[in-house]
Structure formats: C-alpha cells, structure tokens
C-alpha cells in the first residue's frame, strides 16, 4: 500500500486547512491509527492528533479545539484532519503516520502554506503570499513617500528661487551705486574666503553642493553657527555673497530659512553709508521682529 497526500496544502488566512492523508492499501489491509505531527526543521515533532479506528480522535492539548475529523460519512482509510482557523504560525511541515494491519507503518509529509487575500471576494487565483503582499505594501508606501518628497523639494525650490530673485532685484537696485566701493573695502579689510569676488567663490548662485572646490567652502552648507556671519554690522557685499551662496539648490535647513528671513527684515531697518550698514533712526531705537523677539 501507499499513502496519498499533497506536497503542499495552501489555505487562506483564517480558513480551515484540510491536511490530507489517505491510505491506498492492498486487499485485506486495515488502518489501525493515524498520527499527525508538526515536524518543522530544527524542532522536535509536536503531536497534533491521533486518529484511532476504534477510539476515535484524540487531539493534543496544544491544538485542543482546532483539530477535527471530516464529518461522516467518512472513508475508513481517510486519515485526513482539519486544522481550524489557520494562522500564519501554522505554516510549516506536517507529517502523517499511518499504522496498518498487516502491512505495518507508513508516513508522508506535506507543507502547509497560509495565504493572505487582498480582497476576500477574489478567487484563489488572486491570492498572494503574505510576504509578497508585505513587500508590495512597503514598496507602494515607499514610492508614495518618495513622490511626496520630490513634490515638496520642487515646491520649496521654486519658492526659494522666487524669493531669492525678489531679494536680488531689490538689493541690486539699492546697491548699484555702492557696489564697487563695497568690493574695495572688502578686499582691504577682510581675508575671509567667503568675501571674495563671485569668480573665486566655490559655490555660485546657480551652483550645487557638488561644485564645491574644496572642503573649506563646506562651512557654507553646515548648520554650525560659525559657518556664517549674520552680524547686522557686516558689509553689504558680505550679505550679498551669503545670499548667493544660500540660493536654491544648496539644501538649506529650516533654521537657515529663518535667518534668511531675518536678513530681509533687518535690511528694512538699516541704511547704507560708505559701504557699511547703519541702523535707521526710529522712535525708540528698538526693533521687534515678526516673532516678537527683541533685536
């Protein structure tokens, strides 16, 4: 005789799994008992149930209430059992051992696979493996997040480009008369590489971080306070250069945007005299910025 089973039994999450084990015997042979066990690699066999021709079904405590025989009429040679309400943890190898008289013992193994279905109304052809479903879901979420990021970056860059253009136009108008004078003063009073003419600065208005010529210019990109000087008593050219360095594409952080906004607001409260900025005279000499902080 021989045992008939399936190599793989596939069941949908939450459904009952039929674990088939049918003894195809020779004339006069009888099935005495069928023992079912879980036999996952690396672990000892865990008994599920014992099906006795005379005493019926005995289910092990670990599977109490979850293992049943098919209802009658039953073929006496059918050692199949039902595993109720299959969960992911049930996935694995199972073995059925059939004791027959007089032929002796037979055993066969099968693998139980538990599937998750995206839509319970869909037929089994549309069922997908839980792992595959997880991968797909993660992939979709990642793709959506990436698209969102791209949209945010594009919108931000457009916004900053517009802002920078407005600032540049405004400054260009105000500073045209003093530009040459400012540059001369810068050369005579500063050695900071950030105050060099445009041609010698590693990162231009339209440049990207990749175009930095040496690491010394990276301080422009850093978030460390010493990376920039935003003193209100700095030169016009220095402000102008910093504006160019922090133009769209340079990857500014939120903190930097706030400082940028601060510059714009501050400019309204200073006048240019001989290439330097001096505070405009006001009623009380105190300037309160948009956030209500004293400057």
């Amino acid at each position: 005789g021989e045992l008939e089973t399936s190599d793989v039994v596939t069941v949908v999450l939450g459904q009952d799994a039929k674990l088939p084990c049918f003894y195809r015997g020779d004339s006069g042979e009888q099935v005495g008992q069928v023992a079912w066990a879980r036999v996952d690699a690396g672990e000892g066999a865990q008994e599920l149930a014992l099906l006795h021709s005379k005493y019926g079904l005995h289910v092990s405590p670990a599977y109490e209430g979850r293992v049943e025989q098919p209802p009658p009429p039953r073929n006496p040679l059918d050692g199949s059992v039902l595993l109720r309400n299959a969960v992911q943890a049930d996935e694995g190898e199972y073995e059925c051992r059939v004791s027959t008289f007089p032929a002796g013992s037979f055993q066969a193994r099968l693998r139980l696979r538990v599937l998750v279905v995206l839509d319970p109304q869909e037929d089994s052809g549309k069922q997908v493996d839980l792992v595959s479903a997880s991968v797909v879901v993660v992939g979709v979420i990642a793709a959506l997040l990436f698209c969102l990021l791209v949209v945010v970056v594009v919108l931000m860059s457009r916004y900053h480009r517009r802002k920078a253009q407005q600032m540049t136009q405004k400054y260009e108008e105000e500073l045209t008369l003093t530009r040459e004078n400012s540059i001369r003063r810068l050369h005579s009073h500063h050695t900071d590489p950030r105050s060099q003419p445009e041609e010698s600065v590693g990162l231009r208005a339209e440049g990207h971080p990749d175009s930095l010529k040496d690491n010394s210019s990276c301080s422009v990109m850093s978030e460390e306070p010493e990376g920039r000087s935003y003193s209100t008593l700095t030169t016009v050219r220095e402000i102008e250069t910093q504006t160019e360095l922090l133009s769209p594409g340079s990857g500014r952080a939120e903190e930097e945007e706030d400082q940028d906004e601060g510059i714009k607001q501050a400019m309204n409260h200073f006048v240019q005299e001989n290439g330097t900025l001096r505070a405009k005279p006001t009623g009380n000499g105190i300037y309160i910025n948009g956030r209500g902080h004293l400057v």
């Epitope: 799994a17 039929k18 209802p71 009429p73 073929n75 059918d78 039902l82």
Partner: antibody
Framework: QVQLKQSGPNLVQPSQSLSITCTVS????????AHWVRQSPGKGLEWLGV???????DYNAAFMSRLSITKDNSKSQVFFKMNSLQADDTAIYYC????????????WGQGTSVTVSS | DFQVTQSPASLSASVGETVTITCRTS??????LAWYQQKQGKSPQLLVY???TLADGVPSRFSGSGSGTQYSLKINSLQPEDFGTYYC?????????FGGGTKLEIK
Amino acid sequence: QVQLKQSGPNLVQPSQSLSITCTVSGFSLTTYGAHWVRQSPGKGLEWLGVIWRGGSTDYNAAFMSRLSITKDNSKSQVFFKMNSLQADDTAIYYCAKIGYDGYAMDNWGQGTSVTVSS
Amino acid sequence: DFQVTQSPASLSASVGETVTITCRTSENIHNYLAWYQQKQGKSPQLLVYNAKTLADGVPSRFSGSGSGTQYSLKINSLQPEDFGTYYCQHFWSSPWTFGGGTKLEIK
C-alpha cells in the same frame, strides 16, 4: 481495464423492490469501495449511498429506511436493493467505483434504466 | 439543510472560447469536491477531484479551483467534445449532494 457492469430489471411495480447487481473487473472490492447514484428523467444526479472496501456502508438519510447495499468480494459484485418503490423512483441507477482520493467516482457503470409503473 | 448551488444552469459558447462554471456550497467543504461531465445518453465521467486535481486522462484545458464555499471549473479553448452537462459534487457531510448541473451548448 476497470469496468462496472450492471444488471437488473427495467420495470418495477409500485411498492415492489428494486435489485441491481454491479459486477466489477480490473480492481478489487477489497481495495476500492462503490457508490450508488440515480438520475431521474430530465433531472440531475442524486447520491444514494456508498459501500466502503471494508464492507461498512453510509446512506443518504432520505433513503436509509428502504435502502441496502452489500457486496461479495470473491465474486467482485456489489448488490443494491431499494424497497417500496413509487413512480417518482423512476430513474437511471448507476454504480460507480470510488476513485483514488477515496471519495470521488472515477469509473461508472452503464446505468440501469428503471421505470416504476403498474 | 446543506445546499449546493451550481451556476449557470445553461451556457452557450463557441468552439475556442473559455467558459467557467461555478459551484457554491452552504458551508465550508474543505476542497472535498469533484466535477463530472455527462454527455447525452451516457454515464458521467470524473474530471476533477479534491477541487483542483485533474483525473487521469482529462485534458489540461480543464482546471478546477476554489476553496471554502466557492469552487469553479474552467474550460479553456472549448472543443466540440466538451459540450454536455457538468455537475459538481461535494463529499463533506451526508448526503453527498450534486449540484443542479450546467448544460453547455454550442452557440
């Protein structure tokens, strides 16, 4: 080659019994059991009962009180007997071998057409 | 009472077409289901058992699928010899009822 040959009357008087013999070849009745099924004129199939290879039987509850299925392994014969036939028992009666799965019917007899009439 | 509902009751199709016949049961039958084909004046023939397993000698254009309470028989690229009546039968709890049948006719 598996074969199932049926023999029995084609006409039965109302309230009388119907007996059909199914003689099998190509397999042993100690290895495979047999089903009995009927088909009323212009209608579908109706399962009546089964005899397992060990000799135990299961019947459709609707026919249990008047149905008997037995067999003789040595003669390779299965016997079907239904009592108290009425006009609505007029049908083609089939015997069929249990298949490899232990339940489905993988080989069928030629059928016995039975008319219940006086 | 246990119900087996087969649909459609009749179906017209042309040679080469693909058709699907469905069988619904009133409770989970755990793949204990078979499909049969019967031609006029002949005995039924087993096509599929255990819901998905093709019986010996059955062409591969036939396929069974489903689980739980819903099962189907699909016939790809219909051939002239495929026309006839198809039945499903469950082997769950007694009685082992057949579906009402689906008559497949040539269009």
